[in-house]
């Protein structure tokens, strides 16, 4: 029987800068029941606080609700593992909420085949930012990426759309049914999951374009 091994805070994420959750990985348990506590202080403070919510984020997690989340202050946190034989501490982790944002996927992805009379046909798609993200404040710049593939293909073709919420693709295989998805990331954060797939049937008379790339 031994003191517990060193835990590790291995992930912190925020969906929108208003709340966030951190997760830790326990070290070895030393063969005894082990209690874990996460303590933190904010920059400029010496007073240590205990995790406000061990439940919401699931096992081995600490959730910071709105009243505990500040974008202006860096959090300095560590996890303490304790059993009857002793204690061990994780490394201190510095958390700036700006740098842990992982938004929900973009919404309302719509895809259409456009066949203008005077130009080559193209695939046009548009989407909306996730609802939890407030883009009006200027705190967020969301970047978007699209991926698509014929239904039976193994490989995805990806296109970076920058900050735009609509996109054109010129080069597609006629007669194929395509899956299209979009995801987003804040300029300092993490990619969202991919949106649910939208399916689009490319007409058999769709004329392949020589230029493989996209237009904005």
């Amino acid at each position: 029987q031994l003191p517990p091994g060193k835990p590790e805070i291995f992930k912190c994420r925020s969906p929108n800068k208003e709340t966030f959750t951190c997760w830790w990985r326990p070290g070895t348990d030393g063969g005894l029941p082990t209690n874990y506590s996460l303590t933190y202080h904010r920059e400029g403070e010496t007073l240590m606080h205990e995790c406000p919510d061990y439940i919401t984020g699931g096992p081995n997690s600490c959730h910071f609700g709105k009243q505990y989340t500040s974008m202006w202050r860096t959090y300095v946190m560590m996890v303490n593992a304790t059993n009857q034989m002793g204690s061990s501490f994780s490394d201190e982790l510095y958390v700036d909420v700006t740098y842990i944002v992982q938004p929900d996927p973009p919404l309302e992805l719509t895809v259409e085949v456009k066949q203008p009379e005077d130009r080559k046909p193209y695939l046009w798609m548009k989407w909306s930012p996730p609802t939890l993200i407030d883009l009006k404040t200027g705190w967020f710049t969301l970047l978007y990426e699209i991926r698509l593939k014929p239904e039976k293909a193994a490989e995805w073709e990806t296109h970076f759309a920058g900050q735009q919420t609509e996109f054109k693709i010129l080069s597609l295989h006629p007669g194929q049914k395509y899956l299209v998805q979009v995801r987003c990331k804040p300029d300092h954060g993490y990619w969202s999951a991919w949106s649910p797939a939208t399916f689009i049937q490319i007409p058999s008379d769709f004329i392949m374009n020589d230029h493989h790339h996209h237009h904005h």
Epitope: G44, D91, Y94, T98, I100, G138, W139
Partner: antibody, heavy 118, light 112 residues
Amino acid sequence: EVQLVQSGAEVKKPGSSVKVSCKASGYTFTSFWMHWVRQAPGQGLEWIGVIDPSDTYTNYNQKFKGRATLTVDESSSTAYMELSSLRSEDTAVYYCARGDYSNWFTYWGQGTLVTVSS
Amino acid sequence: DIVMTQTPLSLSVTPGQPASISCRSSQRLVHSNGNTYLHWYLQKPGQSPQLLIYKVSNRFSGVPDRFSGSGSGTDFTLKISRVEAEDVGVYYCSQSTHVPWTFGGGTKVEIK
């Protein structure tokens, strides 16, 4: 204990490429972004770029875009910085550096001296 | 790119005496989120740089309280209240508000 251990010194000819490695240990490699910074002899520090090991997203200093390539090997918890079309001005110590969930450098590798000389 | 200008270039200090390093940025360093990402690093002889101060005035873990940072906008200062022998090295200010992140040219501190 977090450690970043870099590959050994290199001597390269102008026009060639160099690939510096940075092996991470003591933490979950994919959890934190890895930066690269260089320091020419007797000079200050210069940020090259950053990679997110969880999905290989990169952001480069425009000065190095097209010449520097940042990659990772998740299986060995190793980050790489490759610099191509080397010139004498690229002679420098190259550092990998890790932040926490922040935008400053908490941990640094020991540095790798790259000498470009004909 | 943001240019970070440090003064003086070098500083020779008697142990126990104070020291002050100035750092000026070519643009304001206030991020759109309201934070000012101005940091100070020390590179001791033959070593990699190490973080001293983050976000203008916050001492990093384990940094002695004789180090303090201050400033706002474009003008920032690092102060050492009583210099000790172990404080020798090159001090760099750094901004990470704007990409690319940039560093000052460094201030070499030596002991008299």
